[in-house]
């Protein structure tokens, strides 16, 4: 029961996490910035992985995709890649984990197969979460680096002077969504891996080996456990209370993974 709960909870936590990673990737608020201020109007800027938007205090809003920009930072491409890899791995992990859930019966799927699938999905969730956390962290680092490096300077350019303006910037909501979502996916993955240990059969699969004596003799082990000379041994190691000796045919059972010699 505890294994089923751990697996189910891991699945739900990962599902929420991956939904968060998708949301963060699509959000425009990865960074926010005050672009312009005068006594009448303030121009506020928020940027995502795919487009940048300006919003004015008057209510005017305009968004523009980065496809118009030639010199995109290489780090941005790396962040995009990390987030997409995280989403893809997470989606595959979710698909695998659905079939691995103990509460869902699919044909005659063995527990060992479900355990393997649970472990696979768990590892996928862990990698997905790490990708998201890495992507968001790389972006945050890029922001801090770029803003601190572009200190106020003025230089002569073609047609006049160029001045870098110092503006206030903050981490956007998407960064926090990404960090939390990545963490949840990671936790969900760990829970799936823990559940996998409980799903896997604990007993070692021994092959039974028996030796035939010359006659149909029946031996008794101390403590009342019946031992037999043939393959039809008492597989459950049940005590014999009736005290009567039985022939091999009378106790015939099929070999199982719990066979003992």
């Amino acid at each position: 029961m505890a294994v089923t709960a751990c697996q189910g909870l891991g699945f739900v936590v990962s599902l929420i996490g991956i939904a968060g990673i998708i949301a963060a990737t699509c959000m425009d608020q990865w960074s926010t910035q005050d672009l312009y201020n005068n006594p009448v109007t303030a121009v506020f800027n928020y940027q995502g992985l795919w487009r940048s938007c300006v919003r004015e205090s008057s209510g005017f809003t305009e968004c523009r995709g980065y496809f118009t920009l030639l010199g995109l930072p290489a780090m941005l491409q790396a962040v995009r890649a990390l987030m997409i890899v995280g989403i893809v791995l997470g989606a595959i992990g979710l698909l695998v984990s659905i079939f691995a859930l103990k509460c869902i019966r699919i044909g005659s799927m063995e527990d060992s197969a479900k355990a393997n699938m649970t472990l696979t999905s768990g590892i996928m969730f862990i990698v997905s979460g790490l990708c998201a956390i890495a992507g968001v962290s790389v972006f945050a680092n890029m922001l801090v680096t770029n803003f601190w490096m572009s200190t106020a300077n003025m230089y002569t350019g073609m047609g006049g002077m160029v001045q870098t303006v110092q503006t206030r910037y903050t981490f956007g909501a998407a960064l926090f969504v990404g960090w939390v979502a990545g963490g949840l996916t990671l936790i969900g993955g760990v829970m799936m891996c823990i559940a996998c240990r409980g799903l896997a059969p604990e007993e070692t699969n021994y092959k039974a080996v028996s030796y035939h004596a010359s006659g149909h003799s029946v031996a008794y082990k101390p403590g009342g456990f019946k031992a037999s000379t043939g393959f039809g041994s008492n597989t459950k190691n049940k005590k014999i209370y009736d005290g009567g000796a039985r022939t091999e045919d009378e106790v015939q059972s099929y070999p199982s993974k719990h066979d003992y010699v």
Partner: nanobody, 120 residues
């Protein structure tokens, strides 16, 4: 890099009118705001008027009601219609453009300036 070309300056009598224009060209992501500044001989550069991408305008108290700032977003051109000019309006007028640079600080570009002389 943004290039700014100003035009329309010259000599005008008090009470007269002039129209300044500033054309921005080059490769840039987005112009956030444009404005006009002026610098009279022996004085500091001061703000005359600004206009944002959304069309919000701001004027210095000394020019309110006399000057009108406008822009053509499609042509990336800024205009300043100056009416009822006074002798104290004599200055070099500079065009200013604030350009958004994704993931970095914005850049302010300044034109070379155009001289406006109000004299009888």
């Amino acid at each position: 890099e943004v290039q700014l070309v100003e035009s329309g300056g010259g000599l005008v009598q008090p009470g007269g009118s002039l129209r300044l224009s500033c054309a921005a060209s080059g490769s840039f992501f987005r112009i956030v705001a444009m404005g006009w500044y002026r610098q009279a001989p022996g004085s500091q550069r001061e703000l005359v008027a600004t206009i944002t991408r959304g069309g919000s305008t701001y004027y210095a108290d000394s020019v309110k009601g006399r000057f009108t700032i406008s822009r053509d977003n499609a042509k990336n051109t800024l205009y300043l219609q100056m009416n009822s000019l006074r002798a104290e309006d004599t200055a070099v007028y500079y065009c200013n453009v604030r350009v958004e640079v994704p993931f970095m600080q914005p850049n302010d570009y300044w034109g070379q300036g155009t001289l406006v002389t109000v004299s009888s």
